[in-house]
């Protein structure tokens, strides 16, 4: 069984999720990369992807999602700005490598967005929520649609573990054949 880990981020509406996915530089620098959401019982859904081939540090924006692939650093940076409660869920980065199936990058991100002000904690009703105005989309890459004989019958279960501290991880065990997953738009 493959041991999967995820990191939990608890943010307020209006805030920004800013995370990185490390990859093997020599192997995947120019490969197309994607940001996916995994909903319970469903296949991973691609929300945004880099261009093909992926351009170095060239921002790709799809709605409130901004992807930047830093080839020289070996990392994909993902930002989700002006978060909404509905953005809560389990996310992952993958690398497209046709004709093979996408390669999942560790760690997964468990995002929990709650209502409330992203300003000073305990602020009153008159506080101004920080809603950052997104500039117009500059580049929107088309994400490929993959089909695969493999199936994933169920997404990893929502953890009931207490993962409120930054260093905590959710260890998902007894998950097999989960790393190579087909991608659906």
């Amino acid at each position: 069984a493959t041991k999967l880990t995820e990191e939990k981020y608890e943010l307020k509406e209006g805030q920004t999720l800013d995370v990185k996915c490390d990859y093997t530089l020599e192997k995947f620098a120019s490969s197309q990369k994607a940001w996916q959401i995994i909903r319970d019982g469903e296949m991973p859904k691609t929300l945004a992807c880099t261009e093909r081939p992926s351009k170095n540090s060239h921002p790709v924006q799809v709605g409130r999602i901004i992807l930047e692939d830093y080839h020289d650093h070996g990392l994909l940076r993902v930002r989700m700005v002006n978060l909404q409660v509905e953005d809560s869920g389990l996310y992952q980065c993958v690398i497209y490598q046709p004709p093979k199936e996408p390669h999942m990058l560790f760690d997964r991100i468990r995002l929990v967005v709650t209502k409330g002000f992203s300003g000073t904690p305990g602020s009153n009703e008159n506080s101004t929520q920080n809603v950052y105005k997104i500039p117009p989309t500059t580049t929107k890459a088309l994400c490929p649609l993959y089909t695969s004989p493999r199936t994933v019958t169920q997404a990893p279960p929502k953890s009931t573990a207490d993962v409120s501290t930054p260093d905590s991880e959710i260890n998902l065990t007894n998950v097999t054949d989960i790393i190579r997953v087909p991608v659906f738009n």
């Epitope: 943010l11 920004t16 995370v19 490390d22 901004i66 992203s118 105005k133 930054p166 260093d167």
Partner: antibody, heavy 121, light 105 residues
């Protein structure tokens, strides 16, 4: 608990090189970036670069490219920062610091105790 | 290159509220954190993700953001809070603000 222990103070002559070590314990060394930050006397904090201990890859601030090298020895969970062609302007306290999480670059939650490097003829 | 701007100094009387600002281009879509630095010590993370406090940091420390300006607020300031404070964000590289010296009168 997470600890970063740095090597002791150094006195160097202009033009020489210095190599500062940062020994990590209390966590999986490969999982988190190590950053190097310095503070010169009377100056602010200055980020020098990061090291990805897993791949060995480093990213340097533009100012330091070409004269700083960040490496690691995973067998002893130690990161190194080497600064060459030292001048008196490099007299500073040098800190190593660790990312708070595996999936972010900032913030730095854990810091070494600092290493004073004095460059003097 | 990316820059974060802080006031060089802020003064406050004991028990009063101190506010330190940090401004930068597109800071609204960056996560901001704050560090406290006292002479002879290593920096201490006091706020991350704009407004979260690490364990062990007193409740009088809080963070907020308005547009492209982040604010560190210390309510009921104590003498022990006298220190230099630095904001930090991740652009393409990691950037620190120039630092603000907080003086408790």
């Amino acid at each position: 608990q997470v600890q970063l222990v740095q090597s002791g103070a150094e006195v160097k002559k202009p033009g020489a090189s210095v190599k500062v070590s940062c020994k990590a314990s209390g966590y999986t060394f490969n999982g988190y970036y190590i950053h190097w930050v310095r503070q010169a006397p009377g100056q602010g904090l200055e980020w020098m670069g990061w090291l990805n201990p897993n791949s060995g890859g480093a990213n340097y601030a533009q100012k330091f490219q070409g004269w700083v090298t960040m490496t690691r020895d995973t067998s002893i969970s130690t990161a190194y920062m080497e600064l060459s062609r030292l001048t008196s302007d490099d007299t500073a306290v040098y800190y190593c610091a660790r990312d708070q999480r595996k999936t972010t670059v900032t913030p730095f939650e854990y810091w070494g105790q600092g290493t004073l490097v004095t460059v003097s003829s | 290159s990316y820059e974060l701007t802080q006031p060089p100094s802020v003064s406050v009387s004991p028990g009063q509220t101190a506010s330190i600002t940090c401004s930068g281009d597109k800071l609204g879509e960056r996560n901001v954190c704050w560090y406290q630095l006292k002479p002879g010590q290593s920096p201490i993370l006091v706020i991350y993700q704009d407004n979260k406090r690490p364990s062990g940091i007193p409740e009088r420390f809080s963070g907020s953001k308005s547009g492209n300006t982040a604010i560190l607020t210390i309510s009921g300031t104590q003498a022990m809070d006298e220190a230099d404070y630095y904001c930090q964000a991740w652009d393409r590289n990691v950037v620190f603000g120039g630092g603000t010296k907080l003086t408790v009168l």
